[in-house]
């Protein structure tokens, strides 16, 4: 099923890409290209019997193109508003600049202490799980070597069950590996929430009447940090997938050689164990530092907030994360409204349905226009 997150990512990546290019040059491509990218998401889904994907696609594309145009229009305005918000906030915090900086510093250290054990655990788990994966797969290679040594009468019939098993075991163990490692990213999210909440409480006395503005800035920080956690999850997942794609051919190679001569088979079985070890070790080396790098990125984001709120803030492109947050909120809201309607539609009569579809079109318009008004 196409998710709100996938749609928002396509839209945001597309928007960022446009922002980096000369706007005018790509103006005429905008609508059709975004539509193409969104339609591509639905490509695999449309063969399915249910009409859910088709209905969603019909309603989503106009909503998305309109939202995209609105984003482009509001980007500069938002940049100004965020700048103004920060100025007011800085002015309010200026008399307490040292205390504010110190509070953020304390919070930063607290965050590091909170996250360090998790990064260590993630590193240890990567190592443990990689070793487990290697231990789980090695016996299949050894069994095949043994069958080959004992030179059973019907080599193909005797080796093939092991090769088939290895094929499945690679997939199953990589799934297991993902299942063991990705929860760390979710754990990080909880720690982010706790840390930002504490920061909010410790800065509240200094913000006074600009509390709303401070909250808005902290929401932006939380969004950025959680986005990092999502990226961590995605990277772990992608690395595990890559491992699967590197291991799968090893099993296929053996299965391919079953049809050939014994020599080729001997060679491929002799190399199998070594290749398994090598690929797993490479995965371990690549993924072990992910936790530490993630921590560094969070610390850096907290440090940026300290600079933003400090007296010597330079020009920061901070509005983009607010814009992205807003986009994601809108798309999520569109999806949940669509899902609600979808479940209601199942129990509605045709005249009610037609009436409801008219209302839906009006609502879509409203949803796009609702680009979060900033507290000013």
């Amino acid at each position: 099923e196409v998710s709100a997150d996938q749609v928002a990512t396509v839209m945001w990546d597309y928007f960022s890409q446009l922002s980096n290019n000369a706007k005018e040059a790509v103006e005429h491509l905008q609508k059709s290209e975004l539509t193409q990218q969104l339609n591509a998401l639905f490509q695999d889904k449309l063969g399915e019997v249910n009409t859910y994907a088709g209905d969603l696609q019909k309603k989503l594309v106009p909503f998305a193109t309109e939202l995209h145009e609105r984003l482009a229009k509001d980007s500069e305005k938002l940049k100004e508003e965020i700048g103004k918000e920060l100025e007011e906030l800085r002015a309010r915090l200026l008399p307490h600049a040292n205390e504010v900086s110190q509070k953020i510093g304390d919070n930063l250290r607290e965050l590091q202490q909170r996250l360090e054990p998790y990064a260590d655990q993630l590193r240890t788990q990567v190592s443990t799980q990689a070793e487990q994966l290697r231990r789980q797969l090695t016996p299949y290679a050894q069994r095949m070597e043994r069958v080959l040594r004992e030179n059973a009468d019907s080599l193909q019939a005797s080796l093939r069950p092991h090769a088939d098993e290895l094929k499945a075991k690679i997939d199953q163990n990589v799934e297991e590996l993902k299942g063991r490692l990705t929860p760390y990213a979710d754990e990080f999210k909880v720690k982010i929430d706790q840390t930002v909440e504490e920061l909010r409480r410790s800065l509240a006395p200094y913000a006074q009447d600009t509390q709303e503005k401070l909250n808005h800035q902290l929401e932006g920080l939380t969004f950025q940090m959680k986005k990092n956690a999502e990226e961590l999850k995605a990277r772990i997942s992608a690395s595990a997938e890559e491992l699967r794609q590197r291991l799968a051919p090893l099993a296929e190679d053996v299965r391919g050689n079953l049809r050939g001569n014994t020599e080729g088979l001997q060679k491929s079985l002799a190399e199998l164990g070594g290749h398994l070890d090598q690929q797993v070790e490479e995965f371990r080396r690549r993924v072990e530092p992910y936790g530490e790098n993630f921590n560094k990125a969070l610390v850096q984001q907290m440090e940026q907030l300290r600079q933003k709120l400090g007296p010597h803030a330079g020009d920061v492109e901070g509005h983009l994360s607010f814009l992205e947050k807003d986009l994601r909120d809108k798309v999520n809201s569109f999806f949940s409204t669509f899902k609600e309607k979808e479940s209601q539609d199942k129990t509605l009569s045709l005249p009610e349905l037609e009436q409801q579809q008219e209302q839906q079109q009006e609502q879509q318009q409203e949803q796009v226009q609702m680009l979060a008004p900033l507290e000013s």
């Epitope: 059973a152 019939a157 093939r160 069950p161 088939d164 075991k169 997939d171 799934e175």
Partner: antibody, heavy 117, light 107 residues
Framework: QVHLQQSGAELVRPGSSVKISCKAS????????MNWVRQRPGQGLEWIGQ????????TYNGKFKGKATLTADKSSNTAYMHLSSLTSEDSAVFFC??????????WGQGTTLTVSS | DIVMTQSHKLMSTSVGDRVSITCKAS??????VAWYQQKPGQSPKLLIY???TRHTGVPDRFTGSGSGTDFTLTIYNVQSEDLADYFC?????????FGSGTKLEIK
């Protein structure tokens, strides 16, 4: 928990064909071999073949080649077995079974096929 | 194909007794043997694999042994709910093959 739900009993004419389904739930369907086993009335079990839903790879027992065709649909977590040119000899209970580490750790409830004119 | 022979079609036993069901492979299959239990009107259930490893949730009254060509499933302290057909299976070589089954009846 793992559950394999098979389609209902079938009564068909000789010469026709039939497609039996097995819907899996409670585990990652695409990364386990799905096997099919035949049990004739009052007799033992015979392995028909297996399919790997992840890529559609199949292994057949030579005895059933040309009789059984195995397919799988990842989007609905369902495995299918198509049996063709049916005769009264094909009357049996057919089971789907998940292969976990070589052996069949979970079985469907069975589908009874009766071929009769 | 490897033939798995279960010479006893029917075995009678009493509650509390010990019973041994045997299975012979037509060629060496190492320890690649499983045992399944099939109660009347039900699908088979895995009991033992790798000749002697009990599947999750199987009572320790069920024990498997053997290697090469001769295998045994022993049920200690037989219970009335053990009334069933028992099948051995080899998975050393394709096609995987089953024994013809042994029916356990409770006297």
């Amino acid at each position: 928990q793992v559950h394999l739900q098979q389609s209902g009993a079938e009564l068909v004419r000789p010469g026709s064909s039939v497609k039996i389904s097995c819907k899996a739930s409670g585990y990652a369907f695409s990364i386990y071999w799905m096997n099919w086993v035949r049990q004739r009335p009052g007799q033992g079990l015979e392995w028909i073949g297996q399919i790997y839903p992840g890529d559609g790879d199949t292994t057949y027992n030579g005895k059933f080649k040309g009789k059984a065709t195995l397919t799988a649909d990842k989007s609905s977590n369902t495995a299918y077995m198509h049996l063709s040119s049916l005769t009264s000899e094909d009357s049996a209970v057919f089971f789907c079974a998940r292969r976990g580490d070589y052996v069949y750790d979970y079985w469907g409830q069975g589908t009874t096929l009766t071929v009769s004119s | 194909d490897i033939v798995m022979t279960q010479s006893h079609k029917l075995m009678s036993t009493s509650v509390g007794d010990r019973v041994s069901i045997t299975c012979k492979a037509s060629q060496d299959v190492g320890t690649a043997v499983a045992w399944y239990q099939q109660k009347p009107g039900q699908s088979p259930k895995l009991l033992i694999y790798w000749a002697s490893t009990r599947h999750t949730g199987v009572p320790d009254r069920f024990t498997g042994s053997g290697s090469g060509t001769d295998f045994t499933l022993t049920i200690y302290n037989v219970q009335s709910e053990d009334l069933a057909d028992y099948f051995c299976q080899q998975y050393s070589t394709y096609p995987f093959t089953f024994g013809s089954g042994t029916k356990l009846e409770i006297k």
